[in-house]
C-alpha cells in the first residue's frame, strides 16, 4: 500500500467538535500523532492555514467523499491512506459524542487508529492492537501500541533511530581513513574541496594528495560546529552554509554580517527544519536542496523556488537516495553524492551513476 515518502508530515484540524474544548481536541490529536512518532522517524507538525498533508475533519452524513457517515454508533471515523488531495485525511463522525475519557467515544483512541490508516496501516487481526477494527476503550494514561502495531508501522517507516546520524561522542578528530567515515557536508570553494564533519573540516586542494584538518572555529569563529549542508556559487565568490533552520553566507572566505538567516527565506514550507545537502549547478544556475527523501530546486537568478517541487530524490536521480548526507558539483558534469561511507559519482547529463567510491576516496586512503 501507499506510504508517505517523507518524514516531515503536516496536519491541520479543519474544524472542531462542539463536544469538547478546542484545547482538548488539539491535545488529543497531538498526542495521537505522538504515539506514532515515538516509534518511527516521522515528525508531525500542526499548521493552521494552507494545505496540510493530513486534514482532520469532524462531519456528519454526506461530507465530501463517497463514504457518508451513518449517524450515532456504527462507523465512528475513517481515514484515507497516504497520498495527495484527500490522501491521509481523517474524518470523524460528528454524530458521535467525542470525549477525553471513557464516556461517549474517546477521541484520542479513535485518532490513534485513524492516523494509523493515514500513515498506511490496514486493520490488524490482533484484538490487542489499536489497528483492530472495532473500538474498545482502554485507559488512555497507560495506553501503549501493541507489538503488532509497532511491527506494522516500522515495516513501513523503520524505527526512530533510522536515518539519524549519531554525533561523534567525544568530538575528537575523526580518523580520515576510517572506512566507515561519513561527512556532514561537502562543497567546492574555488579550486578546493571542503569536507565538513562535526567541528572539523578537511581541505583538499584539487589534484593534490595532501589534505589538512582544521577546526571550523579557527577559520570562521562565528560559525557553529556540525554544518549540515553547503554549496558554492563560484562566479559570485559565495559559499552558503546550513545548520538546522539557519544559513550563513561566506563571501570571499569571509562571513557576511547580518547572518544567520532563516532557511525559510528561500521559500521552504514551515515543516522543513533542516537541509541535508545542497549543490549549485552553474550550467542551469539552479541550486538543488535535499531534505529527507525529497529535493527542491531554487532559481538563483530569480531568487525563488521553481514550481513543481519538492520531488522524490529516487525518482529523479537514478540510484541515489532515498536520503543523502552531502553533495558537491565538479568537472562541469558530475555531482558527487555522499551516503554514509559511500560516495557516488553521478553524471547529470547522462542522468546515471558512473562510479561508486568510498566517501574518503579523495584523501588517497
Amino acid at each position: 500500500g501507499p506510504v508517505w515518502r517523507k518524514h516531515y508530515i503536516t496536519y491541520r484540524i479543519n474544524n472542531y467538535t462542539p463536544d469538547m474544548n478546542r484545547e482538548d481536541v488539539d491535545y488529543a490529536i497531538r498526542k495521537a500523532f505522538q504515539v506514532w512518532s515515538n516509534v518511527t522517524p516521522l515528525k508531525f507538525s500542526k499548521i493552521n492555514t494552507g494545505m496540510a498533508d493530513i486534514l482532520v475533519v469532524f462531519a456528519r452524513g454526506a461530507h465530501g467523499d463517497f463514504h457518508a457517515f451513518d449517524g450515532k454508533g456504527g462507523i465512528l471515523a475513517h481515514a484515507f491512506g497516504p497520498g495527495s488531495g484527500i490522501g491521509g485525511d481523517a474524518h470523524f463522525d460528528e454524530d458521535e459524542f467525542w470525549t477525553t475519557h471513557s464516556g461517549g467515544t474517546n477521541l484520542f483512541l479513535t485518532a490513534v487508529h485513524e492516523i494509523g490508516h493515514s500513515l498506511g496501516l490496514g486493520h490488524s487481526s490482533d484484538p490487542k492492537a489499536v489497528m483492530f477494527p472495532t473500538y474498545k476503550y482502554v485507559d488512555i494514561n497507560t495506553f501503549r501500541l501493541s507489538a503488532d502495531d509497532i511491527r506494522g508501522i516500522q515495516s513501513l517507516y523503520g524505527d526512530p533511530k533510522e536515518n539519524q546520524r549519531l554525533p561523534n561522542p567525544d568530538n575528537s578528530e575523526p580518523a580520515l581513513c576510517d572506512p566507515n567515515l561519513s561527512f556532514d557536508a561537502v562543497t567546492t570553494v574555488g579550486n578546493k574541496i571542503f569536507f565538513f564533519k562535526d567541528r572539523f573540516f578537511w581541505l583538499k586542494v584539487s589534484e593534490r594528495p595532501k589534505t589538512s584538518v582544521n577546526l571550523i572555529s579557527s577559520l570562521w569563529p562565528t560559525l557553529p560546529s556540525g554544518i549540515e549542508a553547503a554549496y558554492e556559487i563560484e562566479a559570485r565568490n559565495q559559499v552558503f552554509l546550513f545548520k538546522d533552520d539557519k544559513y550563513w553566507l561566506i563571501s570571499n572566505l569571509r562571513p557576511e554580517p547580518n547572518y544567520p538567516k532563516s532557511i525559510h527565506s528561500f521559500g521552504f514550507p514551515n515543516f522543513v527544519k533542516k537541509i541535508d545537502a545542497a549543490v549549485f549547478n552553474p550550467r542551469f544556475y539552479r541550486t538543488y536542496f535535499f531534505v529527507d527523501n525529497q529535493y527542491w530546486r531554487y532559481d538563483e537568478r530569480r531568487q525563488m523556488m521553481d514550481p513543481g517541487y519538492p520531488k522524490l530524490i529516487t525518482k529523479n536521480f537514478q540510484g541515489i537516495g532515498p536520503k543523502i548526507d552531502a553533495v558537491f558539483y565538479s568537472k562541469n558534469k558530475y555531482y558527487y553524492f555522499f551516503q554514509g561511507s559511500n560516495q557516488f559519482e553521478y553524471d547529470f547529463l547522462l542522468q546515471r551513476i558512473t562510479k561508486t567510491l568510498k566517501s574518503n576516496s579523495w584523501f588517497g586512503c
Epitope: 494545505m51 465530501g64 467523499d65 463517497f66 484515507f80 497520498g83 488531495g85 490508516h117
Partner: antibody, heavy 122, light 103 residues
Framework: EVQLLESGGGLVQPGGSLRLSCAAS????????MHWVRQAPGKGLEWVSG????????FYADSIKGRFTISRDNSKNTLYLQMNSLRAEDTAVYYC???????????????WGRGTLVTVSS | DIQMTQSPSSLSASVGDRVTITCRAN??????LNWYQQKPGKAPELLIY???SLQSGVPSRFSGSGSGTDFTLTISSLQPEDFATYYC?????FGQGTKLEIK
C-alpha cells in the same frame, strides 16, 4: 500506459438488459476503486456507480439503484456493469474510470476509457 | 445531500483572454473538488484535483483555487486547444458543465 477499454454497448429495447465490460491494462488493477460515469447525448457527466478493490463496498446513483449492478474480476482485470430494466433515459455513452485511490474512494478519476454507447429505444 | 452549482453554463472568449469558471457547493467540501476538461467526442481528462493541485502534464496556465463551498478554475491565457467543456466534480456529483466557445 494505462488503458481502459469499454465494450458491450449497443441498441436495446426498453425493459431490456445489457452487460458492459471494461478491460484494464497498464496498471495493477486490484488495489483501486473503479467507477462507471455516463453522459447522455448533448448533456453533462453523471456518476453511475463505484466499486471497492475487493468487489465491495459498492455505491450507486439513486437514478439506477436496484436496476444496475457493478462488479469486477480482479483475475481478469475487468470491471462490469450489469444493466437491467433499461429505460430511454439510460441512453448515454458509458465511461469506465479509475479512481486514484484504494481502501476508501476519493472520487478522483485519473484515467477514463473512451466510452461505449448504450441506446435504449423501441 | 451535497449539490454542485457551476457557472456560467457557457461563455465566449478569445485566444489570450483570462477566463474564470466557478463552482459552488451547498455545504463545505473542504478542498475535495476536481476539475475536468472534455473535448467533443472524447473522454474527460483530469485538470485539477484537491481544488488547486495541477495534474501532471497539464499546462501551468490552468489553476484552481478555493476551499469550503466556493471554487474557481482559471485559465490565465486562453489557447486554441482550450475551447472545450469544463466540469467540476466532488465524489459522485458533477457540476452541469461550462462550455467555453470561441468569440
Amino acid at each position: 500506459e494505462v488503458q481502459l477499454l469499454e465494450s458491450g454497448g449497443g441498441l436495446v429495447q426498453p425493459g431490456g438488459s445489457l452487460r458492459l465490460s471494461c478491460a484494464a491494462s497498464g496498471f495493477t488493477f486490484s488495489p483501486y476503486w473503479m467507477h462507471w460515469v455516463r453522459q447522455a447525448p448533448g448533456k453533462g457527466l453523471e456518476w453511475v456507480s463505484g466499486i471497492g478493490p475487493s468487489g465491495g463496498p459498492t455505491f450507486y446513483a439513486d437514478s439506477i439503484k436496484g436496476r444496475f449492478t457493478i462488479s469486477r474480476d480482479n483475475s481478469k482485470n475487468t470491471l462490469y456493469l450489469q444493466m437491467n430494466s433499461l429505460r430511454a433515459e439510460d441512453t448515454a455513452v458509458y465511461y469506465c474510470a479509475k479512481d486514484i485511490r484504494g481502501a476508501y474512494s476519493s472520487g478522483l478519476f485519473d484515467y477514463w476509457g473512451r466510452g461505449t454507447l448504450v441506446t435504449v429505444s423501441s | 445531500d451535497i449539490q454542485m452549482t457551476q457557472s456560467p453554463s457557457s461563455l465566449s472568449a478569445s485566444v489570450g483572454d483570462r477566463v474564470t469558471i466557478t463552482c459552488r457547493a451547498n455545504q463545505s467540501i473542504y478542498t475535495y473538488l476536481n476539475w475536468y476538461q472534455q473535448k467533443p467526442g472524447k473522454a474527460p481528462e483530469l485538470l485539477i484535483y484537491a481544488a488547486s493541485s495541477l495534474q501532471s502534464g497539464v499546462p501551468s496556465r490552468f489553476s484552481g483555487s478555493g476551499s469550503g463551498t466556493d471554487f474557481t478554475l482559471t485559465i490565465s491565457s486562453l489557447q486554441p486547444e482550450d475551447f472545450a467543456t469544463y466540469y467540476c466534480q466532488q465524489a459522485g456529483i458533477f457540476g452541469q458543465g461550462t462550455k467555453l466557445e470561441i468569440k
